[in-house]
Amino acid sequence: RPSFSLVEDTTLEPEEPPTKYQISQPEVYVAAPGESLEVRCLLKDAAVISWTKDGVHLGPNNRTVLIGEYLQIKGATPRDSGLYACTASRTVDSETWYFMVNVTDAISSGDDEDDTDGAEDFVSENSNNKRAPYWTNTEKMEKRLHAVPAANTVKFRCPAGGNPMPTMRWLKNGKEFKQEHRIGGYKVRNQHWSLIMESVVPSDKGNYTCVVENEYGSINHTYHLDVVERSPHRPILQAGLPANASTVVGGDVEFVCKVYSDAQPHIQWIKHVEKNGSKYGPDGLPYLKVLKHSGINSSNAEVLALFNVTEADAGEYICKVSNYIGQANQSAWLTVLPKQQAPGREKEITASPDYLE
């Protein structure tokens, strides 16, 4: 995240009534793999409803059905897990409702606690067919990001085969994972290719890598564990927003920043500027100007509209959001083209989002 030398103050001043934000934890819909799930968009008076998953537009396909205010997912898989949103567009405004979908069995990593189905994961090979390690059940490894409430049990699995039978070891954040690294240690069930951690706590957050190897090769797979506490969170910004944009000189452009926050957020739009001919202050940090912020005199702060743009408006625009817990920021670039060139949305160079927790 960038450091800033501010031309204008950017302090915590959340003044705008929170009509645009969901000020609570998103509702969680849980489904087991293979089940169907139906969710109703809990927004009133919606003329048009659009859906997103993890910030990406969601359209109908052979498993996803969108009918009016309902979203149906048929034959759910772990890939369907994520942060969903429905946006109701009305004539005067729009409103977004967020919810989580978690497609998983009772405990994490798509497996039931007793490992009753584990036998097929332990593949015996003909002793003549020497073979480097390989994954035997990639479906159970699809869900890489596991957001688990504190005190729950987590299981990560890496079902594999090979000849001779490979060995499995686990790393946490790229280093050997030792029993003493967590209170209560952990269990490894080699016959089920699994790592089990009971009663997870925030310090268990991180990347867990299984390394499966024999004399013919080595393969690995990484899971990310996020331990969700029942405490307020800093803002989350929808992935891919604001999006890069281009327009011709004299044209208009809009940047949108979609905010999810369980505490009242304060939104600021900031741009790199020059001061006395320099882009950087004496401390080496860039000069930044607050173009817009949420407050009593500002309309929808999630949108920054620029009219009749000039070449001087080109550059990076930062959406910075803070609540009393923390901050998040994402940025996008505006390209201003000479009059004769046609503008277009620059999907291919969308700024990479600043993912949080």
Partner: antibody, heavy 113, light 107 residues
Framework: QVQLQQPGAEVVKPGASVKMSCKAS????????IHWVKQTPGQGLEWIGA????????SYNQKFKVKATLTADKSSSTAYMQLSSLTSEDSAVYYC??????WGQGTLVTVSA | DILITQSPASLSASVGETVTITCGAS??????LNWYQRKQGKSPQLLIY???NLADGMSSRFSGSGSGRQYSLKISSLHPDDVATYYC?????????FGGGTKLEIK
């Protein structure tokens, strides 16, 4: 687990300054605001201000803007509050808190000649 | 600044009873209200955030309600361990003002 360690007490002379520390552990220091709160028997709890260690952003209660200066050292995961021109009115317990969710034990500041 | 008025200032109740503490804000704070419990000689502990959400590790005997300008904290089936001073706090806008506190005692 999340911990915020503060020195137990500071005794200072009127007119002097004091700089108290708040050492954070058990979480990513740069991800959360550190708030400072004053507790006195007469006034109850008062919010002094906050600092975001990632970029040094600060926000102050206007009442304490001249009195308090907030800083943070990312390398040691420590937040600091300096109080200047101390008077008997500044005698109080000062807490640091991570986003009001986790609180330090507090530093008792006694201003005495 | 948003003014937070908390009542009562002190409260005495018997074990097993249900008690309610209220907080009023000088303007609409849209549910941006936290409750804290401070036991004698200890630091404050987050009890309820966002007016209604129970914080980690706190007993479900505590519940928060309210919206707009009026909020309340309910403690059901009072335990001797609940003896403390309870504070509400505006977290909508800076300065994040606290209520004056309610000292809860057991009869």
């Amino acid at each position: 687990q999340v911990q915020l360690q503060q020195p137990g007490a500071e005794v200072v002379k009127p007119g002097a300054s004091v700089k108290m520390s708040c050492k954070a552990s058990g979480y990513t220091f740069t991800d959360y605001y550190i708030h400072w709160v004053k507790q006195t028997p007469g006034q109850g709890l008062e919010w002094i201000g906050a600092i975001y260690p990632d970029n040094g952003d600060t926000s102050y209660n206007q009442k304490f803007k001249v009195k308090a200066t907030l800083t943070a050292d990312k390398s040691s995961s420590t937040a600091y509050m300096q109080l200047s021109s101390l008077t008997s009115e500044d005698s109080a317990v000062y807490y640091c808190a991570r986003a009001f969710t986790y609180w330090g034990q507090g530093t008792l500041v006694t201003v005495s000649a | 600044d948003i003014l937070i008025t908390q009542s009562p200032a002190s409260l005495s109740a018997s074990v097993g009873e249900t008690v309610t503490i209220t907080c009023g804000a000088s303007e609409n704070i849209y549910g941006a209200l936290n409750w804290y419990q401070r036991k004698q000689g200890k630091s404050p502990q987050l009890l309820i955030y966002g007016a209604t959400n129970l914080a980690d590790g706190m007993s479900s005997r505590f519940s928060g309600s309210g919206s707009g300008r009026q909020y309340s904290l309910k403690i059901s089936s009072l335990h001797p361990d609940d003896v403390a001073t309870y504070y509400c706090q505006n977290v909508l806008s800076t300065p994040y003002t606290f209520g004056g506190g309610t000292k809860l005692e057991i009869k």
